[in-house]
């Protein structure tokens, strides 16, 4: 009679993570008598996956009833497959022996490959806000996918970005892989409503790529522009001066009025108006009693935006001229000499 052969008909099996893998194995003879065992790997370090004779293998079920006397089908199913299950599985026939069974013949092995989906990409931006025209870096990470082949793209709004670097780790063979990418983005004043998108495409994703997003509103700081103007006279001795704070983001802003360098009033921006581009405008006004001043008055609107060093704009109010003679912008030259940065 021909000697028993152990046949593993599938050289390789590809299974999606979470699914069940079927590893097929048949013997060509009932002789010699003895159990079958399944191992992952070969040699002394091999891992026992299933022992027909003894042991508890909760994830493994047999395809056939191995207790039947004439059974020659030793195929198994392994449930809830993860990337860690990848490897070559051997169906090994043992001959009954005393005290221990002796390995008789092994199948050629079946390589189990596991396809695992990448995790949802996580996009993170810089720790500190940056202003328009600066370049900031965004990172995108996704993990746990297999096989290694993967495609990553970056978008800013409707445009694909090209300035990025991507690494897939590890470089060598592994049960699963991770991808890390860093993109450089140049900020513009219109970016409050902008989004950066990282898109990951993988063979396991049949429906669509996975996308992670970051809102540039978390990253950008648009510094305000200031304009100080003198309004027409409200009363004989009173002048109304306004400070227009325009196009700033985020909203966090504190304004201080100084009269000849002395603090007159401090207020926090509350009832702001929002522009189409997502930036804010705000206006503060100061009523100056001209009769209380003997000399010309230097009025300064000083703004501290989002914890940054204060910026200011000054306006010279000439007391010598009769208030009624002053137009809406007289003395409000706002030349460079009237602008001061306070650091």
């Amino acid at each position: 009679e021909e000697e028993l052969q152990v046949i593993q008909p599938d050289k390789s099996v590809l299974v999606a993570a979470g699914e069940t893998a079927t590893l097929r194995c048949t013997a060509t003879s009932l002789i010699p008598v003895g159990p079958i065992q399944w191992f992952r790997g070969a040699g002394p370090g091999r891992e026992l996956i299933y022992n027909q004779k003894e042991g508890h293998f909760p994830r493994v079920t047999t395809v056939s009833d191995l207790t039947k006397r004439n059974n020659m089908d030793f195929s198994i199913r392994i449930g809830n497959i993860t990337p860690a299950d990848a490897g070559t599985y051997y169906c090994v026939k043992f001959r009954k022996g005393s005290p221990d069974d002796v390995e008789f013949k092994s199948g050629a092995g079946t390589e189990l490959s596991v396809r695992a989906k990448p995790s949802a990409p996580v996009v993170s931006g810089p720790a500190a806000r940056a202003t328009p025209q600066h370049t900031v870096s965004f990172t995108c990470e996704s993990h746990g996918f297999s096989p290694r082949d993967i495609t990553l793209k970056w978008f800013k709004n409707g445009n694909e970005l090209s300035d990025f670097q991507t690494n897939v780790d590890p470089v060598g063979e592994s049960v699963s892989y991770s991808i890390h990418s860093t993109a450089k983005v140049v900020l513009t004043r219109e970016d409050v409503h902008s989004q950066v998108i990282c898109e990951v495409a993988h063979v396991t994703l049949q429906g669509d790529p996975l996308r992670g997003t970051a809102n540039l509103s978390e990253t950008i700081r648009v510094p305000p522009t200031l304009e100080v103007t003198q309004q027409p006279v409200r009363a004989e001795n009173q002048v109304n001066v306004t400070c227009q704070v325009r196009k700033f983001y985020p909203q966090r802003l504190q304004l201080t009025w100084l009269e000849n360098g002395n603090v007159s009033r401090t207020e926090t921006a509350s009832t702001v108006t929002e522009n189409k581009d997502g930036t804010y405008n705000w206006m503060s006004w100061l009523l100056v009693n001209v009769s209380a001043h003997r000399d010309d008055v230097k009025l300064t609107c000083q703004v501290e935006h989002d914890g940054q060093p204060a910026v200011s704009k000054s306006h010279d109010l000439k007391v010598s001229a009769h208030p009624k003679e002053q137009g809406s912008n007289t003395a409000a030259e706002n030349t460079g000499s009237n602008e001061r940065n306070i650091y």
Partner: antibody, heavy 119, light 107 residues
Framework: QIQLVQSGPELKKPGETVKISCKAS????????MHWVKQAPGKDLKWMGW????????TYADDFKGRFAFSLEASASTAYLQINNLKNEDTATYFC????????????WGQGTTLTVSS | DIVMTQSQKFMSTSVGDRVSITCKAS??????VAWYQQKPGQSPKALIY???NRHTGVPDRFTGSGSGTDFTLTITNVQSEDLADYFC?????????FGGGTKLEIK
């Protein structure tokens, strides 16, 4: 070359059921999703939904929930569209289309199956 | 849903001419637009994917451009066999949506 071959034309009465097949060849069937698209006479193309060929999970567009069912026979590389309780407005040509990694567009289409529903 | 608008329902051109067919998305779809050609009684054939990439075997007379919301399919040196319907598809998100189509007529 990659081909999607659909079953032939169907003439049905309102209230009946039809099952249209789409057989794929020359690629690994379970690597790509299969989508279904409706083209009614004189109307725009309308996406009906798709089936994951690896898991068998269907996804239906809002207008195609209820009477429509996508299924598979993965071992035969075949996808199916079944329409129950046929109505006159189901008269159209139905296309299957392959879709998937890495570009996610409909790269190959079946030749279409013309369904006529008439009493 | 994203609405894909092809404002020209019909376009007339002559053999050897250059013609541009446009498609506008109701919201940003970066570059996820494909173009298809459909001849009478046939199934659609892919021409362009991801806005500007030619599908396998498509002649280089067909070019795609655009990003964001505005996309164009250009056919240079039009041939008589180009008589067909042309439509766009957004493949950025679900539900997938198609443009209404532009019928190209040869004078």
């Amino acid at each position: 070359q990659i081909q999607l071959v659909q079953s032939g034309p169907e003439l049905k009465k309102p209230g009946e059921t039809v099952k249209i097949s789409c057989k794929a060849s020359d690629y690994t069937f379970t690597d790509y999703s299969m989508h279904w698209v409706k083209q009614a006479p004189g109307k725009d193309l309308k996406w009906m939904g798709w089936i994951n060929t690896e898991t068998g999970e269907p996804t239906y567009a809002d207008d195609f929930k209820g009477r429509f069912a996508f299924s598979l026979e993965a071992s035969a590389s075949t996808a199916y569209l079944q329409i129950n309780n046929l109505k006159n407005e189901d008269t159209a040509t139905y296309f299957c289309a392959r879709h998937g990694y890495p570009h996610y567009y409909f790269d190959y289409w079946g030749q279409g199956t013309t369904l006529t529903v008439s009493s | 849903d994203i609405v894909m608008t092809q404002s020209q329902k019909f376009m007339s051109t002559s053999v050897g001419d250059r013609v541009s067919i446009t498609c506008k998305a109701s919201q940003n779809v970066p570059t996820a637009v494909a173009w298809y050609q459909q001849k009478p009684g046939q199934s659609p054939k892919a021409l362009i994917y991801l806005a500007s990439n030619r599908h396998t075997g498509v002649p280089d007379r067909f070019t795609g451009s655009g990003s964001g919301t505005d996309f164009t399919l250009t056919i240079t040196n039009v041939q008589s066999e180009d008589l067909a319907d042309y439509f766009c598809l957004q493949h950025w998100n679900y539900p997938r949506t198609f443009g209404g189509g532009t019928k190209l007529e040869i004078k």
